[in-house]
């Protein structure tokens, strides 16, 4: 709980704690001492949950409360207690209040009438000092309803149905110090309603329907210290001195309203204000002098607003500020000298802000800064003198490594090796498959080339992970903006798109031949080559368009360390978002649907023709084998693409997706197709197994002749063993059918399922 901790500590104890020992030890920039010992550790090892110092010093004082959270909680204890069933702790157990309503509880001079279905303020003796009327059915506070309670100090009216408060409702409450009106239906407070509350210190009006306030609203609140107006519907603050009648106001909480701008005069009288919370509003404009009068301000929270521009000197008078939150604003640019005047700043929140012009100069003057929060952990490198920098990972990378997880760091090599080896092996072996149709082979080699690019992409990512090992944070920002990252990212997209389009092309060819065998015209060399060229050109265009227009696409590939543009960031340009969606939910989803539909139709067509066949047992066997093959082709496609579609779709719905997802997708899911395509389309097909069998047979024969000069036969296990994707048992094999699918166009319907290769 950071908001206002500073103020409450000062309020109670009147002085600051120092930041702990070890400050005598001098460490170089980016390093921090391990308490009193001479050891220094880099920023990334402090506050990372691991005892790297050996004496726990690197994990001490990591909480962003500057050591005051306990005091803060103590000060607020009674505020928290108000929601409990018994908000009072009277010194004497017996009731000292005269007349007490039968359903109420009483202890000392304190009265608890919570949840008693009261419709009006009860009448009790005038010596009562605390009265809790929470969770009742009170709708109106009429004139003089508390007039006799001159000793009342605490009044709890939360969770009623109050809509109307008479201007004289609180008349006579001269001793009241705390008034809670939260969770009611108050829409307006009449100027003068608090006139008699000159001892009131806390006024809590959270979760009501207040739409406007003005300085006269608070007339009479001379002693007010804390004013909480959270979660109302205020649209503006007055262009008049808000604190005119609250000269002692220290804490103003306006979180969760609809305020859209701050005026120059609003805070002119708030010279004692220590904490100002204005997060979750709709502030879009700030004037240079808005905060000028707040020279004692310790915390300023402007998070989650609509601020686009920060005037250069907006913080120049905030000499006492120790916590500043600007998170989640669409700030376009931060001036290099924006924070120069905040010499006492200890905590700075810039989460959710894309700082395109980030530089060390911005944060260097903040010598007391101990906590900083960014949108991207890569920015931490620009604040090396700040001990605690968050986030320390984006789920993909960490401060130390491009790939945060050890599993990913190992498997990026395994997967890339499998992908590259499998595809290169197929490319090399294809010419040896005699019965293979040359055009079909060309398509398969093309597919393997595309898939091989995915392996190369993973190799490059793995290589840079090795290169940056242990100090990735120093290079992160530059790496993500580098040409290398852009090129390697476009390589991944090129691979993905060409692979997807080729699979769709191959599938459609098979689909036409199997479902419409008599319409199947064998594709000519010219057409096949044209299609392949078009697919590659399309892939190149899709992959490289984002590099051609930086204005439109921003840093399309450099949104994460693995340079893969999977899900949209809030700050990503609309163009980039649309483009990304068009690829993943347009081209790829359409292709996936075509593939699933085609294989379904093919299987159905084969199944239908098999019904008329005579050899029932053999047909069923064949169908099962075919079904298994089709299932694995569709299943691997689904395994690869469904998670990607889901992630993309969720990001489109603004669902927050953990950064870890991207890295797991890129290393384990995206390459599934690239790694398995060689197996599915080559290594398990009959022609390939024939070729292997031939090699094996020849090899054994040679070996046999060399040793005994005898003829041997290939061992039966080659044929007996059921490969997971084996099409059919050898006795059903018709070698003349294992050719390009369209060559079977004149084959009878009953033998059609033999033809699938």
């Amino acid at each position: 709980m950071t908001s206002g901790s500073v103020f409450f500590y000062i309020l109670i104890f009147g002085k600051y704690f120092s930041h702990g020992g070890g400050q005598d030890v001098k460490c170089s920039l980016g390093y921090f001492p391990c308490g009193n010992i001479t050891k220094c550790l880099p920023q990334l090892l402090h506050c990372n949950g691991v005892d790297d110092c050996g004496n726990q010093a690197d994990e001490d004082n990591c909480g962003d409360n500057n050591g005051w959270s306990l005091q803060f909680d103590k000060y607020f204890a009674s505020y928290y207690k108000m929601t409990s069933q018994y908000p009072f702790e009277a010194e004497t157990p017996e009731c000292l209040v005269g007349s007490v309503p039968v359903q109420c509880l009483c202890q000392g001079l304190e009265l608890d009438c919570d949840e008693t279905n009261l419709r009006a303020v009860p009448s009790v003796s005038s010596n009562v000092t605390a009265m809790s009327l929470q969770w009742n059915l009170i709708r109106k506070l009429p004139p003089d309803c508390f007039k006799n309670y001159h000793d009342l100090q605490k009044l709890y009216l939360q969770n009623n149905k109050i809509t109307s408060i008479s201007i004289y409702a609180f008349r006579g409450l001269n001793s009241l110090t705390k008034l809670y009106l939260s969770h009611n239906r108050i829409t307006f407070l009449k100027p003068g309603v608090f006139e008699d509350l000159h001892r009131l210190e806390w006024l809590i009006i959270e979760d009501n329907h207040l739409s406007r306030i003005s300085p006269p609203t608070f007339y009479g609140l001379n002693s007010l210290i804390l004013l909480v107006l959270m979660n109302n519907v205020l649209t503006r603050l007055p262009d008049k001195p808000l604190c005119q009648h609250m000269p002692r106001l220290h804490w103003l909480d306006l979180e969760g309203n609809h305020i859209h701008n701050l005026r120059n005069l609003t805070f002119i009288s708030c010279s004692n204000l220590t904490v100002l919370v204005m997060r979750k509003n709709k502030i879009n404009h700030l004037n240079e002098n808005t905060f000028a009068p707040l020279q004692k301000l310790d915390e300023l929270d402007l998070g989650s607003n609509k601020i686009e521009n920060l005037p250069p000197l907006i913080f120049k008078d905030l000499k006492e500020l120790s916590q500043l939150n600007l998170s989640y604003n669409p700030i376009q640019k931060i001036q290099a000298n924006q924070f120069d005047y905040l010499v006492k700043l200890k905590s700075l929140s810039l989460e959710g802000i894309e700082i395109s012009n980030i530089q060390q100069r911005m944060f260097r003057p903040l010598m007391n800064l101990s906590h900083i929060y960014f949108k991207k952990f890569q920015y931490c490198g620009y604040a090396p003198h700040v001990r605690s920098c968050k986030p320390n990972t984006d789920g993909i990378s960490s401060l130390e490594n491009l790939l945060a997880s050890i599993i990913q760091r190992v498997f990026v090599w395994v997967v890339s090796a499998v992908t590259c080896f499998g595809n290169i092996f197929v490319i090399c072996m294809r010419p040896y498959i005699r019965s293979e149709n040359k055009l079909y082979a060309m398509s398969i080699i093309s597919l393997c080339c595309a898939d091989c690019l995915m392996g190369i992409y993973l190799f490059v990512i793995g290589g840079f992970d090795l290169k940056f090992r242990g100090e990735y944070n120093k290079h992160a920002q530059l790496w993500m903006e580098s040409t290398h990252c852009q090129l390697v990212g476009s390589l991944a997209i090129l691979s993905t798109e060409v692979s997807v389009l080729l699979l769709t092309f191959l599938t459609l060819e098979k689909y036409i031949c199997i479902v419409y065998p008599f319409r199947c015209v064998r594709p000519g060399k010219c057409r096949t080559i044209t299609v392949l060229i078009l697919i590659w050109i399309t892939g190149f265009i899709v992959a490289f368009i984002p590099l051609s227009n930086k204005e439109f696409f921003k840093n399309y590939y450099g949104t994460n360390g693995v340079c893969f543009p999977l899900h949209s960031e809030d700050t990503e340009s609309i163009g980039a978002q649309i483009y990304s969606v068009a690829i993943f939910l347009g081209i790829n989803l359409a292709a996936f649907i075509i593939i699933v539909f085609s294989y379904g139709s093919m299987f159905y067509s084969v199944h239908q023709s098999a019904i008329t066949a005579t050899e029932i047992r053999n047909q069923v066997k064949k169908e099962m084998i075919l079904a298994k093959r089709f299932f694995f082709i569709v299943f691997t496609d689904a395994l690869c693409w469904i998670p990607i579609f889901v992630v993309k779709f969720l990001s489109l719905l603004q669902v927050e997706i953990p950064g870890t997802i991207t890295s797991w997708v890129v290393i384990f899911i995206l390459p599934i197709n690239s790694a398995l395509n060689p197996i599915l389309y080559t290594l398990t097909t009959r022609p390939f197994k024939e070729m292997i069998h031939r090699f094996w047979y020849n090899y054994r024969q040679r070996k046999s002749m060399d040793s005994k000069g005898q003829k041997t036969y290939a061992p039966s296990f080659i044929w007996v063993e059921m490969w997971p994707l084996q099409e059919m048992p050898p006795e059903l094999m018709k070698p003349d059918l294992f050719t390009y699918p369209c060559e079977m166009s004149l084959i009878s319907q009953s033998t059609r399922l033999n033809s699938y290769s």
Partner: antibody, heavy 119, light 112 residues
Framework: QVQLQQPGAELVRPGASVKLSCKAS????????VNWVKQRPEEGLEWIGR????????HYNQKFKDKAILTVDKSSSTAYMQLSSLTSGDSAVYYC????????????WGHGTTLTVSS | DIVMSQSPSSLAVSAGEKVTMSCKSS????????????LAWYQQKPGQSPKLLIY???TRESGVPDRFTGSGSGTDFTLTISSVQAEDLAVYYC????????FGGGTKLEIK
């Protein structure tokens, strides 16, 4: 600019009732109290009562509690005062006045309606 | 009820002279909490409606010439016109707002 428009004069018979109007413009009607003040010829000012147009909270001078009824019509930004059982003693100029930022003073006044009760 | 008494009931002065008029309250008008005196002064020129001059006993309403000054605290209050002008011919009323509202009988200012 702030204006409170009142009819110039009303003539009514004794025992009858009259409803005086005060139409406000130039400010947010529901944000400020409307007060009514009586001034007899060559006499001082007497406060009759006030109404908050926001929720129709009303406070009366006890002397006029049975004489005057205050109402508002938010849609037309108009305040009304109905005087009943009229006598010659009710003949006077009746002013409406807008409460200030704080309602302890009256920062704008209407021109007044001269009520004459006569048979 | 709080009773407000004004004196003198009328006075005649020459243009340029200084004039003071008094207003006494039957009760203390100082709010100890807000430290404000709940007293206002109004000017009513012949044939016109009243106009606010001073509130909180001494705060001049915007647009009011600075020759008008309010002073006093508790039960005794004074309105001073430092240099009377011809247009100041009017009846001046004090009004308490400590407990509802009560006007004084008024002081009629005439120009010699």
């Amino acid at each position: 600019q702030v204006q409170l428009q009142q009819p110039g004069a009303e003539l009514v018979r004794p025992g009858a009732s009259v409803k005086l109007s005060c139409k406000a413009s130039g400010y947010t009607f529901t944000s400020y109290w409307v007060n009514w003040v009586k001034q007899r010829p060559e006499e001082g000012l007497e406060w009759i009562g006030r109404i908050d147009p926001y929720d129709s909270e009303i406070h009366y001078n006890q002397k006029f509690k049975d004489k005057a009824i205050l109402t508002v019509d938010k849609s037309s930004s108009t305040a009304y005062m109905q005087l009943s059982s009229l006598t010659s003693g009710d003949s006077a100029v009746y002013y409406c006045a807008k409460g200030g930022e704080l309602p302890y003073y009256f920062d704008y006044w209407g021109h007044g309606t001269t009520l004459t009760v006569s048979s | 009820d709080i009773v407000m008494s004004q004196s003198p009931s009328s006075l005649a002065v020459s243009a340029g002279e200084k004039v003071t008029m008094s207003c006494k309250s039957s009760q203390n008008l100082l709010n100890s909490g807000t430290r404000k005196n709940y007293l206002a002064w109004y000017q009513q020129k012949p044939g016109q409606s009243p106009k606010l001059l001073i509130y909180w006993a001494s705060t001049r309403e915007s647009g009011v010439p600075d020759r008008f000054t309010g002073s006093g605290s508790g039960t005794d209050f004074t309105l001073t016109i430092s240099s009377v002008q011809a247009e100041d011919l009017a009846v001046y009323y004090c009004k308490q707002s400590y407990n509802l509202w009560t006007f004084g009988g008024g002081t009629k200012l005439e120009i010699k």
